[in-house]
């Protein structure tokens, strides 16, 4: 069964910077990745970035840079301009659309007591969508 993993990492050098790492474990080719925060895509979450293997990437503030790490994983850098970080309590979700599996989504967040540089363990909560 395909699975999506999500890791949220606070940058050790800059406490207002975070990186979300997401990956797809399974066969098939990725056709689109959508990253959202505050909840799943299409279910109350706010779209932060979309990545397409051919059409490129788009991101919306507070996202700063979305990029492919491998053919099946991505990273998204976020910059919190506020004095206190809302990211610490926020859920980030990654949805991978792949052929022929369909869409799989998983969410993760920064552990409440994490030290800078530590990341949340993978928290796959797959949501199968019949697209």
């Amino acid at each position: 069964t395909p699975e999506v993993w999500v890791q949220v990492q606070m940058e050790a050098t800059e406490l207002s910077s975070f990186t979300v790492h997401c990956g797809f474990l399974g066969p098939g080719s990725i056709s689109l990745v959508t990253v959202s925060w505050g909840g799943p895509d299409g279910a109350g979450g706010t779209k932060l970035a979309v990545l397409h293997p051919e059409l490129g990437t788009r991101q919306w503030a507070p996202a700063r840079q979305a990029r492919w790490e491998t053919q099946s994983s991505i990273s998204l850098a976020l910059e919190d301009s506020g004095a206190s970080s809302p990211f610490a309590n926020t859920t980030f979700c990654c949805k991978f659309a792949s052929f022929p599996e369909g869409s799989w989504e998983s969410c993760g967040s920064l552990p409440p007591s994490s030290d800078p540089g530590l990341s949340a363990p993978p928290t796959p909560v797959p949501i199968l969508r019949a697209d």
């Epitope: 505050g38 909840g39 299409g42 109350g44 979450g45 706010t46 779209k47 979309v50 397409h52 059409l55 490129g56 990437t57 788009r58 919306w60 503030a61 700063r64």
Partner: antibody
Framework: QVQLQQSGPELMKPGASLKISCKAS????????INWVKQRPGQGLEWIGW????????YYNEKFKGTATLTVDKSSSTAYMLLSSLTSEDSAAYFC????????????WGQGTTLTVSS | DIQMTQSPSSLSASLGGKVTITCKAS??????IAWYQHKPGKGPRLLIH???TLQSGIPSRFSGSGSGRDYFFSISNLESEDIATYYC????????FGGGTKLEIK
């Protein structure tokens, strides 16, 4: 086809408030950011802010924080911009525009709403 | 905030000719620039995004290029319907328009 239909022209008095509407059709309203843009007479375009209809999350140009408030009504696929404490500086054309994501920013625009603030 | 300096602010060209508009960003915008045509009484029209990607239905007379901080927009084989004001927009971080270029035909 994608369409954004804005409310009609308005003549308002200084100090008043105005809510401009932008009704979307032809696509899934909750999937795309809606932006608002200002154009003063004879001037260029200025980005006011955006709202993501799926969550109601907003992001404003610092210049317009406190004067513009963006909201949506998902049930009617309508975006709104409330302009408060109007002054003559608010006299302008206001446009809503959809963000097309990978198809480019502001790929569809409303026809504009002209606001005149005068005593 | 990223600033966009667009030049020239106005230009006049002959039918069938070619014009080029420049936008310079205050920092690298990673090719995240779009170009719009705006005619009075209408909403602007997206012509090009991501520096050089032509929007569906836009004639190939319109083109874009550039990288880093410097970007260019050209119209070749000018037609009378091209009379309009043209704007660049950076969308690498938030959104900033250039000041606009008013195109007139000689």
């Amino acid at each position: 086809q994608v369409q954004l239909q804005q409310s009609g022209p308005e003549l308002m008095k200084p100090g008043a408030s105005l809510k401009i509407s932008c009704k979307a059709s032809g696509y899934t309203f909750t999937d795309s950011y809606i932006n608002w843009v200002k154009q003063r007479p004879g001037q260029g375009l200025e980005w006011i802010g955006w709202i993501f209809p799926g969550s109601g999350s907003t992001y404003y140009n610092e210049k317009f924080k406190g004067t513009a408030t963006l909201t949506v009504d998902k049930s009617s696929s309508t975006a709104y911009m409330l302009l408060s404490s109007l002054t003559s500086e608010d006299s302008a054309a206001y446009f809503c525009a959809r963000d097309g994501g990978l198809r480019g920013p502001f790929d569809y625009w409303g026809q504009g709403t002209t606001l005149t603030v005068s005593s | 905030d990223i600033q966009m300096t667009q030049s020239p602010s106005s230009l006049s060209a002959s039918l069938g000719g070619k014009v080029t508009i420049t936008c310079k960003a205050s920092q690298d915008i990673n090719k995240y620039i779009a170009w719009y045509q705006h005619k009075p009484g209408k909403g602007p029209r997206l012509l090009i995004h991501y520096t050089s990607t032509l929007q569906s239905g836009i004639p190939s007379r319109f083109s874009g290029s550039g990288s880093g901080r410097d970007y260019f927009f050209s119209i070749s084989n000018l037609e009378s319907e091209d009379i309009a004001t043209y704007y660049c927009l950076q969308y690498d971080h938030l959104l900033t328009f250039g000041g606009g270029t008013k195109l007139e035909i000689k």
